[in-house]
Amino acid sequence: EINGSANYEMFIFHNGGVQILCKYPDIVQQFKMQLLKGGQILCDLTKTKGSGNTVSIKSLKFCHSQLSNNSVSFFLYNLDHSHANYYFCNLSIFDPPPFKVTLTGGYLHIYESQLCCQLK
């Protein structure tokens, strides 16, 4: 298992919500990405391929997510101060083998300016 801080901008704020960017290498074809808040699994997305190179995307813990060829974005809405925490992208790589797990993360700071519908 490889652990480390994300070496890219992991949190992108917009409209009172946050997009949490979880990157993976372009070469990865089949994987599971979990978003952890502290030690708790908030969201997950699994991409696998069939014999005809068809793709299956599944989630056991569903969040609004977006998949690209090198990242999974998870979206959290209605931010409040309770969202401040360490968030981790837990990537399990199935293909190419051998199986490996990488964990990258960072701390989500919540500032008044990023909250939804603040009172003026």
Epitope: Q30, G50, G52, T54, F94, P96
Partner: antibody
Framework: EVQLVESGGGLVKPGGSLRLSCAAS????????MHWVRQAPGKGLEWVGV??????????YYSDLVKGRFTISRDDSKNTLYLQMNSLKTEDTAVYYC????????????WGQGTLVTVS | DIQMTQSPSSLSASVGDRVTITCQAS??????LSWYQQKPGKAPKLLIY???LLAEGVPSRFSGSGSGTDFTFTISSLQPEDIATYYC????????FGPGTKVDIK
């Protein structure tokens, strides 16, 4: 212990039909892609076709040599794979193996001992 | 369809010899190549997958290398129990086997 046991082989006339079965045990059958591979007497291995898992809507793919004549199906509740062979030709004479493969999260590959089909 | 070729079709070597078999794909298959061993009257056995990864329980004298279209399978020190036919198989797009290489002892 993993076991794949093929049955249903035998002697059949050209133009006839035969249904092979493959009973699986010792692994989670429903998670595996199931293939048929054949080997004519004294010859090399030849892929016949595959049926994917439920995640991929049980999609089937066939080699050009058998397309339109052979049909692969599976019954996950019975841990059984089938090969329906119609319009049989003398060149279909072979030992037929069922094989189970999976790549997620680890790569595994299991083979049965084969069943002989003679078209004569 | 992806075609696989293998050479040589057969070879004889002495116990302890280094044995090398080559396999070529008709198009780029990345590293999606397996090697199988088949002994007479038996089902094939997976030795190597994803070009160079040893299957469970396979001795380390077996190895594989290559990428794209050209691949090599090596037995570093041939043992009597290695007498068999060896097949490469691509699994980049469905499955295709090479024609096989029969290995025996001099």
């Amino acid at each position: 212990e993993v076991q794949l046991v093929e049955s249903g082989g035998g002697l059949v006339k050209p133009g006839g039909s035969l249904r092979l079965s493959c009973a699986a045990s010792g692994f989670t059958f429903s998670d595996y892609f199931m293939h048929w591979v054949r080997q004519a007497p004294g010859k090399g291995l030849e892929w016949v076709g595959v049926i994917d898992t439920k995640s991929f809507n049980y999609a089937t793919y066939y080699s050009d040599l058998v397309k339109g004549r052979f049909t692969i199906s599976r019954d996950d509740s019975k841990n059984t794979l089938y090969l329906q062979m119609n319009s049989l030709k003398t060149e279909d004479t072979a030992v037929y193996y069922c094989t189970a493969t999976i790549a997620v999260p680890y790569y595994f590959d299991y083979w049965g001992q084969g069943t002989l089909v003679t078209v004569s | 369809d992806i075609q696989m070729t293998q050479s040589p079709s057969s070879l004889s070597a002495s116990v302890g010899d280094r044995v090398t078999i080559t396999c070529q794909a008709s198009q780029d298959i990345s590293n999606y190549l397996s090697w199988y061993q088949q002994k007479p009257g038996k089902a094939p056995k997976l030795l190597i997958y994803y070009t160079n990864l040893l299957a469970e329980g396979v001795p380390s004298r077996f190895s594989g290398s290559g990428s794209g279209t050209d691949f090599t399978f090596t037995i570093s020190s041939l043992q009597p129990e290695d007498i068999a036919t060896y097949y490469c198989q691509q699994y980049y797009n469905y499955r295709t086997f090479g024609p096989g290489t029969k290995v025996d002892i001099k």
